[in-house]
Amino acid sequence: GIAIPRNSGCPNSEDKNFPRTVMVNLNIHNRNTSTNPKRSSDYYNRSTSPWNLHRNEDPERYPSVIWEAKCRHLGCVKADGNVDYHMNSVPIQQEILVLRREPRHCPNSFRLEKILVSVGCTCVTPIVHHVA
Amino acid sequence: GIAIPRNSGCPNSEDKNFPRTVMVNLNIHNRNTSTNPKRSSDYYNRSTSPWNLHRNEDPERYPSVIWEAKCRHLGCVKADGNVDYHMNSVPIQQEILVLRREPRHCPNSFRLEKILVSVGCTCVTPIVHHVA
C-alpha cells in the first residue's frame, strides 16, 4: 500500500482491517474523451495476426462483460491472403483489475480481483527447437 | 447496474447514494495462477510490430504503476530486419478500470475510473485513401 498522510477532509473509516477495505464510488469517471474514437476498432480484421472477439459474461463481476481476443490463425497472414507458418500469431495479454461480488450476490460489497485477458494478437518470429 | 436480490448475509450499507458507493476489499485475488507463465514476455521484441514499454506512475491511482506500449516503428519489420512502410504498426488499446483517490490523498476513499492503455502493437494493412 502507499503511505499517504490522512487528509482531515477524508471520509472516516472504522474498519478494523483498514486500509484493506475501502469505499469506492462507482460513478465512473472516463478519462478517454480525447482519444481517437476508432481505437483498435477494425485492427482485429486488418492485422497480419487477426483475431476474433469472444464475449465473456459474469454477473458476479464488475464489469460483467469482458471481450477476449482469440487469434484466428497459428501463423500470420501475408499480403496474398496466405497464412505463413514461418511466423506465429500470439495473443497479447494484460492483467486487469475487476470487482468481484463478495459475498456472492451482494450488491454493495466487492473484492478486487486481477484477471488475465487477451486484448489482441501480434505476429512474432517463432523460437524453433530442433531435435538433435 | 445489475439488479441482484440482497442476500441476508451481505454487509449493510447506510449510504444514501447506494449502490453508487460500495465497499471494496483490496486484498487482491489473483485468478491467473494456471495461465501460461510465458504470457506476452518477449513478444514486444519478437513482434513484426515491436514496442517499447513506458512506465506511467501516479500515486493517486491504484494501481499506481501502469506500463504503456509505444510502437517502435510506423511500419512493420520484415524477415530481413528492414521496416516495411507498406504496412503499419499500430497500438492495441484497451479500456481498464483503476481506482482514483477521491478526495485526493485520501487513503480509504476512491472513485472508479476508466483509462485507455496501449497493451502492445500489431501489424495492419493500411487504409489507403486515394485522391480523386
Epitope: N45, P50, K70, C71, R72, H73, L74, G75, V77, G81, N82, V83, Y85, N88, S89, V90, P91, V124, P126, I127, V128, H129, H130, V131 | N36, K38, R46
Partner: antibody, heavy 119, light 112 residues
Framework: QVELKESGPGLVAPSQSLSITCTVS????????VYWVRQPPGKGLEWLVV???????TYNSALKSRLSISKDNSKSQVFLKMNSLQTDDTAMYYC?????????????WGQGTAVTVSS | DVVMIQIPLSLPVSLGDQASISCRSS???????????LHWYLQKPGQSPKLLIY???NRFSGVPDRFSGSGSGTDFTLKISRVEAEDLGVYFC?????????FGAGTKLELK
C-alpha cells in the same frame, strides 16, 4: 449434426485436372475452416490445403503450384482444384472441418471421394 | 517439414489389454503461444479418420475415458487402458503447430 460430403469425378486421365466439391451442413463456413487431406491406397494421410473461415488459405508448399482452393459461403461449398495429375495422385480425397475451441485439429471428416488417375 | 515417427507400426493385443502408442516429432510442437498442437485419430477399415484426442491430452466429445494422451515438446503417447473390439484400427498422430500439417505413418492395433 456436422456433415461434410465430397463429390468428384472418380476417374481422371493423366495430365488432366481434378475438381472436387465439398458440401457441408451443420455449421457455417464463415465460422470454421475446411481442410483437404488425401490418402493413397493402403498408405498414410497427406494434408493438402486449408481455407480458413475468413477466406485466407494455407497450402502444402510441396503441392502449392498445382492446387487452388476456394469457397462459396452462401452455398456451404468448398472447391478444390488440382492440376497435372499423375498416377501417384490416385487416392481417397477427404474434406474435413477445422476443430472447435481453436484446437487446430480436424474434428469431422467427410466419407471421402475415390480418385483414380489412369488412362 | 516436421516428421512424425510412430512406434510401433503394428501392435497386436488381446481384448482387455492396455495399449500404448508412441509418437515423436522431428522438432518441438510447442507454438509461440505456449500451446502444443498434437492430435490423435483412429481410422477403422473402410472409414474416414475420427478425432480422439486434441492438443496432447484433451478427449474429443464422445470419446471414452479409456483413451488418454500425454507428452510434451517432441514426445507423445496415446494410451488405451482396456482395449475393446471397437478400438481396433489404425491410429495416427498429427501435428498442426507447423505447416504443412503432418501425420505419422500410423500404428495398426490388431488382435493377437
Amino acid at each position: 449434426q456436422v456433415e461434410l460430403k465430397e463429390s468428384g469425378p472418380g476417374l481422371v486421365a493423366p495430365s488432366q485436372s481434378l475438381s472436387i466439391t465439398c458440401t457441408v451442413s451443420g455449421f457455417s463456413l464463415t465460422s470454421y475452416g475446411v481442410y483437404w487431406v488425401r490418402q493413397p491406397p493402403g498408405k498414410g494421410l497427406e494434408w493438402l490445403v486449408v481455407i480458413w473461415s475468413d477466406g485466407t488459405t494455407t497450402y502444402n508448399s510441396a503441392l502449392k503450384s498445382r492446387l487452388s482452393i476456394s469457397k462459396d459461403n452462401s452455398k456451404s461449398q468448398v472447391f478444390l482444384k488440382m492440376n497435372s495429375l499423375q498416377t501417384d495422385d490416385t487416392a481417397m480425397y477427404y474434406c474435413a472441418r477445422q476443430g472447435d475451441n481453436y484446437s487446430y485439429a480436424v474434428d469431422y471428416w467427410g466419407q471421402g471421394t475415390a480418385v483414380t488417375v489412369s488412362s | 517439414d516436421v516428421v512424425m515417427i510412430q512406434i510401433p507400426l503394428s501392435l497386436p493385443v488381446s481384448l482387455g489389454d492396455q495399449a500404448s502408442i508412441s509418437c515423436r516429432s522431428s522438432q518441438s510442437l510447442v507454438h509461440s503461444n505456449g500451446n502444443t498442437y498434437l492430435h490423435w485419430y483412429l481410422q477403422k477399415p473402410g472409414q474416414s479418420p475420427k478425432l480422439l484426442i486434441y492438443k496432447v491430452f484433451n478427449r474429443f466429445s464422445g470419446v471414452p475415458d479409456r483413451f488418454s494422451g500425454s507428452g510434451s515438446g517432441t514426445d507423445f503417447t496415446l494410451k488405451i487402458s482396456r482395449v475393446e473390439a471397437e478400438d481396433l484400427g489404425v491410429y495416427f498422430c498429427s501435428q498442426s503447430t507447423h505447416a504443412p500439417l503432418t501425420f505419422g505413418a500410423g500404428t495398426k492395433l490388431e488382435l493377437k
